[in-house]
Amino acid sequence: GSVPPMVNVTRSEASEGNITVTCRASSFYPRNITLTWRQDGVSLSHDTQQWGDVLPDGNGTYQTWVATRICQGEEQRFTCYMEHSGNHSTHPVPSGNSHHHHHHHH
């Protein structure tokens, strides 16, 4: 069977006026996953995003991440889009320096 990912979105200061938003997916199986940032509902181009490898996390499941740099104050226009085993979920950017975990249920 499949194990849905835990998705976690965080933000960190980049340069002045910019922040880096990172979306991490962990504890999922099988390893095939789509993880991408969307702006105003549409996927960003590949050259504006950085991806981590899909790696084993030691429990028979996998983890990966995607990040992009955006203008501070525009965070609400962005969502992390996750697709795994025919299911999808969207994960907004939290305000301030907080972070939030979403568990995606199949």
Partner: antibody, heavy 117, light 107 residues
Framework: EVQLVQSGAEVKKPGSSVKVSCKAS????????IEWVRQAPGQGLEWIGA????????NYNEKFKDRATLTADKSTNTAYMELSSLRSEDTAVYFC??????????WGQGTLVTVSS | DIQMTQSPSSLSASVGDRVTITCRAS??????LAWYQQKPGKAPKLLIY???TLADGVPSRFSGSGSGTDFTLTISSLQPEDFATYYC?????????FGQGTKVEIK
């Protein structure tokens, strides 16, 4: 102009199924998620689920997971919502809407589904 | 699931009145809140998104505020076409949930 045009009203028997269509125009259909919401007579709004028309991947409200099936046909720019094992409580207006980032910006006109024996 | 509670459930007001509707979330939804207006037999119409951003074509008498768990929709000077039902909706996490609605009626 973005438009979502839904199929016409339906009258169904308890235990049967209904399939509502939502034809999109005026934008790139596969770029945006399509959401489904229902509203029982005189009641509030309830989210059913969403589909990515590009990939077919879905996200369901747990309440509807066992009875709702969302699909999309890229060749006709049409999304579908099928609800099975209908009961009287499913009598409602069913809406499709486009997900623009983090809100629904355009809605279909609604489809009334009446479940009656 | 995040519960959205709107108040009041209905109100009576006159043209020109200032009207305020509140929406409270059962958890932190940051600023991921939208307000819709719905008239009988019609689909909801987007008024405000991200808690305070006015949607295209919406008159400036409508405004939204709040973040976290408490939000407000204000109509600064009620017009005849504003008599309708208003809903809030959270977009922080699925299932996306709506408030139960506030019906604005003519006094």
């Amino acid at each position: 102009e973005v438009q979502l045009v839904q199929s016409g009203a339906e009258v169904k028997k308890p235990g049967s199924s209904v399939k509502v269509s939502c034809k999109a125009s005026g934008y790139a259909f596969t770029n945006y998620l399509i959401e489904w919401v229902r509203q029982a007579p005189g009641q509030g709004l309830e989210w059913i689920g969403a589909i990515n028309p590009g990939s077919g991947a879905t996200n369901y409200n747990e309440k509807f997971k066992d009875r709702a099936t969302l699909t999309a046909d890229k060749s006709t720019n049409t999304a579908y919502m099928e609800l099975s094992s209908l009961r009287s409580e499913d009598t409602a207006v069913y809406f499709c809407a486009r997900f623009l980032g983090n809100y629904f910006d355009n809605w279909g006109q609604g489809t009334l589904v009446t479940v009656s024996s | 699931d995040i519960q959205m509670t709107q108040s009041p459930s209905s109100l009576s007001a006159s043209v020109g009145d200032r009207v305020t509707i509140t929406c409270r979330a059962s958890g932190n939804i940051h600023s991921y809140l939208a307000w819709y207006q719905q008239k009988p037999g019609k689909a909801p119409k987007l008024l405000i998104y991200y808690a305070e951003t006015l949607a295209d074509g919406v008159p400036s008498r409508f405004s939204g505020s709040g973040s976290g768990t408490d939000f407000t929709l204000t109509i600064s000077s009620l017009q005849p076409e504003d008599f309708a039902t208003y809903y809030c909706q959270q977009f922080w996490t699925t299932p996306y949930t709506f408030g139960q609605g506030t019906k604005v009626e003519i006094k």
